[in-house]
Amino acid sequence: MKVLQEPTCVSDYMSISTCEWKMNGPTNCSTELRLLYQLVFLLSEAHTCIPENNGGAGCVCHLLMDDVVSADNYTLDLWAGQQLLWKGSFKPSEHVKPRAPGNLTVHTNVSDTLLLTWSNPYPPDNYLYNHLTYAVNIWSENDPADFRIYNVTYLEPSLRIAASTLKSGISYRARVRAWAQCYNTTWSEWSPSTKWHNSYREPFEQH
């Protein structure tokens, strides 16, 4: 049994880091493998993560963490029984993938303005809470070419757009994702999408 692709890990900078790797053949990850991880910190102990299958030869492990600070470094040991398959380390602050925003809501009752709001996925005491910026994706269910991205570079988890920038009388969907420049993070996953019917009063044409 050998590791084909070494574990790579990303942290949500809150409570979970996810590590993925590939074995050289079909593997029952949860019964055959264990990923031991330990914070490099005085009087810390090793903790065990039981991996799950992620495709035939792929494994994924969700490492529980109390919290994360920039200096944190973890040792990682991948075991198959008594055999050490791989040894490495992981610094969560250098591999951050933020949590996806939630509760995306489209408010259509504000004159001819669409107000999109969502929730910051972090509690106020988390460092990322005040460092997230967002991308909002809006697309038409009827027209695949009608696909747009709005970058929200301010901290407020909301976006206002004129309803007239979208076509009237058709359904749209929106989703939002987050990233943090301070840690050069990857983008989060997209939030679940929300749907609304776009309708607004056409301005009366003057002749």
Epitope: L43, S44, M65, D66, D72
Partner: antibody
Framework: EVQLVESGGGLVQPGGSLRLSCAVS????????MSWVRQAPGKGLEWVSS????????YYADSVKGRFTISRDNSKNTVYLQMNSLRAEDTAVYYC??????????????????WGQGTTVTVSS | DIVMTQSPLSLPVTAGAPASISCRSS???????????LDWYMQKPGQSPQLLIY???NRASGVPDRFSGSGSGTDFTLKISRVEAEDVGVYYC?????????FGQGTKVEIK
């Protein structure tokens, strides 16, 4: 009520051995690291050794490394200090102390918040 | 290894007066989680040491509020706002950031 009771001290000749015990009650023993600290007559405090709650992490002062062994039996709520090749400079009162919570991913520290009454070790010919 | 230096080593004080003990470490005790791994202990004559302050400024359970700890990084202070007769003893600072844990030399507080 938290209690730590040391025992096993005594008079021993240089080169001899002693095993100190620290029996604990009043808290979830296996969750906490434990430490030994000593105090030579008329001197200050000197850290000797520490062990994590699960026993997997062990640390020693350079002055005792290779001669002393810390261990614990979580089923008996007891931490031990095996002292071999004892020297005159090991003469001291030995205290055990409750250290940080070590079963969490990041150990939680609240100081050495409980200490035993101490046991006296005298190394002399 | 981290070295802890206390001053003064002897502190005669009038009952009811304030007292202050300084502790300096040879390297920063501030970890990136925001905590200073610096404790203060008191040892009364003939007794075991007892914890007064942990993580720089947190008073241990049952410790009177006349005791306070302050400082960050390498410089720390223990203050007793009004010294009482029962405060007589030796006070130690200790770093718990890394092993070997290191104690200061101790400061002997006595009533004038």
């Amino acid at each position: 009520e938290v209690q730590l009771v040391e025992s096993g001290g005594g008079l021993v000749q240089p080169g001899g051995s002693l095993r100190l015990s620290c029996a604990v009650s009043g808290f979830t023993f296996s969750s906490y690291a434990m430490s030994w600290v000593r105090q030579a007559p008329g001197k200050g405090l000197e850290w000797v050794s520490s062990i994590t709650g699960g026993g997997g992490g062990i640390y020693y002062a350079d002055s005792v490394k290779g001669r002393f062994t810390i261990s614990r039996d979580n089923s008996k709520n007891t931490v031990y200090l095996q002292m071999n090749s004892l020297r005159a400079e090991d003469t001291a009162v030995y205290y055990c102390a409750k250290d940080r919570i070590s079963i969490t991913i990041r150990p939680r520290y609240f100081g050495l918040d409980f200490w035993g009454q101490g046991t006296t070790v005298t190394v002399s010919s | 290894d981290i070295v802890m230096t206390q001053s003064p080593l002897s502190l005669p004080v009038t009952a009811g007066a304030p007292a202050s003990i300084s502790c300096r470490s040879s390297q920063s005790l501030l970890y990136s989680n925001g905590y200073n791994y610096l404790d203060w202990y008191m040892q009364k004559p003939g007794q075991s040491p007892q914890l007064l302050i942990y993580l720089g400024s947190n008073r241990a359970s049952g410790v009177p509020d006349r005791f306070s700890g302050s400082g960050s990084g390498t410089d720390f202070t223990l203050k007793i706002s009004r010294v009482e007769a029962e405060d007589v003893g030796v006070y130690y600072c200790m770093q718990a950031l890394e092993t070997p844990y290191a104690f200061g030399q101790g400061t002997k507080v006595e009533i004038k």
